[in-house]
Interface confidence: medium
């Protein structure tokens, strides 16, 4: 008799692929424009990041440090009205993109909470979650969590007023601790928030402790869904060299839970390639005229158009693990496993019961290994094949679809390996 | 006038769980919160946790497997339950009035007598 | 969690002396800073809160200071009412933790 095939968990649409947050609108589309109807004529291009979500804003009403002046139920009338923003739901859920808002209240001011005044900002939140929540909008961001006193009980009650509307609608939380303490006692009284932090970006670029780092939070948080992302807002560029940004994209991708990309990750966007732009929100670079201060300063590869005309760019990664991500079983809601593969390597399984299961690979350091995969590591329903196909490498050269064998395994400096195998009995 | 009044066994064996109501009077439960605070004899304050108005508690992490605090409303009534005590956790229980968790004004104004 | 760090654990003084207690915090506590006299046998009572504000009924002899990590309480001309125990505790984020205490004696 067949063996019997494993009960598929429930999987809210955040589960199924990354999100992308446009923390700043203006910068996000360059040449002065930046409103929401703007914004609208760029979803085609989401679309074919194959992102699930999509982050937005703050866009609200807010006078620097002046509570009184600050509005949740309004939108700037610098991004557009509330009739555009209406206009940008409706063509964002025809795309299946869903459309989460910015809602950290003080953005444009020192503390973002406004610490002095709390039950006013807590009572406005309340307000705007209700007010927003019938608009439309399918989750809520609030970042700098650090900064709002009694951050736990807060996120409880607007996780409550967003899971009562609906169950699936989603509640964000940022914060810049990079401390697991601190960032599991924000979970602890939260079931299913889910939080952006600062807690990857320690990882020091070497292998040994990006896994200790992943297994470390994973065994931790449980079964709960994560999310991973460098940071609650920042570019991979601001804490990887370039070399390690393919790597990060794949390990993101296939980490179980939710990838969040910020805008203009999947090209390398780098604020400090372009002299005079800020770091937190650097112009996006859409092609060679979008940054015209310094002529010359910006070359075709740096853009979204030349690396979407190059099947070898980081774009196009990008795009190809998005796909497989949204797709794959395994990758969807699978079983994760790590193993040791030798110094300066971080491996892993993703499995789920009789599903096609997937191999990765990574070698952080800059010199090529081989690696010496200890599959004894691995539970029996997780056992390694003596081959795998290769689906793809982080690096040009290798020929995609062969079957590699894994006890030969060679990786180049900063390469990462994602392979195939099937479910044996 | 604001009261906080406890009730509960003063004895319980080793391993066995403990059970302390606070009734209180002068104020509603859907105005204030409730803390609860130990004090082993001759020892400092420890904070257990809390009820706030909309029925969201907080624990001691170092606790929280242990701990339990629920209310009702309609009785001014918030119960404290801990399970599986030892000696070490003799003391003295207090429950104290705070505020509600928007308020920038906190402190525990009003405590029990223990 | 937040760690609170109370000194001196004990102070002998004077009826008339001025004290001062001070409490520092492991984390940026942004002032939300309670301190409680407990009297030997009773109950804890409130005297300051939000680090500088005087409870109701607490006399101007007391006083409560700092922000960040850094916290104060000050009693001028010690009265023989104000001997007893002191405790910090803060109010930024769950657990609440209190300080360790402070004994105030008459010497």
């Known amino acids: 008799r067949a063996p019997r095939c494993r009960e598929l968990p429930a999987q809210k649409w955040w589960h199924t692929g990354a999100l992308y947050r446009i923390g700043d609108l203006q910068a996000f589309q360059g040449h002065g424009a930046g409103n929401l109807a703007g914004l609208k004529g760029r979803l085609d291009y989401l679309s074919s990041l194959k992102v699930k979500g999509l982050v937005l804003g703050p866009i609200h009403k807010n006078q620097k440090d002046d509570v009184a002046q600050t509005d949740l139920l309004q939108i700037d009338p610098n991004f557009g009205s509330k009739e555009d923003f209406d206009s940008l739901l409706q063509s964002a859920k025809k795309k299946s993109i869903r459309v989460i808002l910015d809602l950290t209240p003080n953005y444009r001011g020192e503390n973002s909470w406004f610490s002095t005044q709390v039950d006013t900002v807590a009572t406005k939140v309340k307000d705007a979650l209700e007010f927003w929540l019938q608009a439309g909008v399918d989750g809520f961001q609030v970042r700098d969590i650090e900064n709002l006193k009694d951050a736990s009980s807060f996120l409880a009650e607007w996780q409550n007023i967003t899971k009562g509307f609906s169950e699936d609608r989603l509640l964000i939380a940022g914060t810049n601790s990079s401390d697991l303490q601190q960032i599991l006692s924000l979970l602890e009284s939260n079931k299913d928030l889910l939080l952006t932090s600062s807690y990857l970006s320690d990882s020091g670029s070497t292998g040994e402790h990006t896994k200790s780092l992943v297994t470390q939070y994973l065994n931790a948080t449980g079964n709960r869904w994560c999310s991973w992302s460098l940071s609650q807002a920042r570019l991979l560029t601001s804490f990887l060299p370039a070399q390690l940004l393919r790597l990060y994209q794949l390990m993101l991708f296939t980490l179980p839970g939710t990838p969040v990309f910020s805008y203009g990750d999947e090209i390398g966007l780098d604020a400090a390639a372009l002299p005079g732009q800020p770091m937190e929100a650097p112009v996006m670079l859409w092609d060679e005229s979008s940054f015209p201060d310094i002529p010359g300063a910006v070359s075709a590869n740096m853009t979204v158009k030349g690396q979407s005309e190059d099947p070898g760019s980081l774009l196009s990664l990008f795009r190809r693990l998005s796909d497989q991500r949204s797709k794959e079983r395994s990758l969807l809601h699978g079983d994760f496993h790590a193993f040791s593969a030798g110094p300066g390597l971080f491996s892993y399984i993703r499995h789920w019961d009789q599903n096609e299961r997937f191999l990765v690979v990574l070698n952080f350091g800059d010199v090529g290994l081989s690696a010496g995969l200890q599959a004894s590591d691995l539970p029996a329903s997780a056992s390694l094949p003596a081959k795998a196909d290769l689906l793809l490498s982080t690096q040009p050269g290798r020929e995609e679809g062969s079957p590699l064998e894994l006890e030969r395994l060679k990786l180049e400096p900063h390469e990462g390996l994602l392979l195939r195998f099937p479910y044996a009995a | 006038q604001v009261q906080l009044k406890e009730s509960g066994p003063g004895l319980v064996a080793p391993s066995q769980s403990l059970s302390i109501t606070c009734t209180v009077s002068g104020f509603s439960l859907t105005t204030y919160g409730v803390h609860w605070v130990r004090q082993p004899p001759g020892k400092g304050l420890e904070w257990l946790g809390v009820?706030?108005?909309?029925?969201?508690?907080n624990y001691n992490s170092a606790l929280m497997s242990r701990l339990s605090i629920s209310k009702d409303n309609s009785k001014s009534q918030v119960f404290l339950k801990m399970n599986s005590l030892q000696t070490d956790d003799t003391a003295m229980y207090y429950c104290?009035?705070?505020?509600?968790?928007?308020?920038t004004s906190y402190a525990m104004d009003f405590w029990s007598q223990g | 969690d937040i760690q609170m760090t109370q000194s001196p654990a004990s102070l002998s003084a004077s009826v008339g002396e001025t004290v001062t207690i001070t409490c520092r915090a492991s984390?940026?506590?942004?002032?939300?800073l309670t301190w409680y006299q407990q009297k030997q046998g009773k109950s804890p009572q409130l005297l300051v809160y939000?680090?500088?504000t005087l409870a109701d009924g607490v006399p101007s002899r007391f006083s409560g200071s700092g922000s960040g990590t850094q916290y104060s309480l000050k009693i001028n001309s010690l009265q023989p009412e104000d001997f007893g125990s002191y405790y910090c505790?803060?109010?930024?984020?769950?657990?609440?933790?209190f300080g360790g205490g402070t004994k105030l004696e008459i010497k």
């Open positions: 009820m706030w108005t909309n029925g969201i508690t």
């Open positions: 104290a009035r705070g505020g509600h968790y928007g308020s």
């Open positions: 939000t680090a500088k």
């Open positions: 505790q803060h109010f930024w984020n769950t657990p609440y933790t």
């Open positions: 984390g940026n506590i942004h002032n939300y």
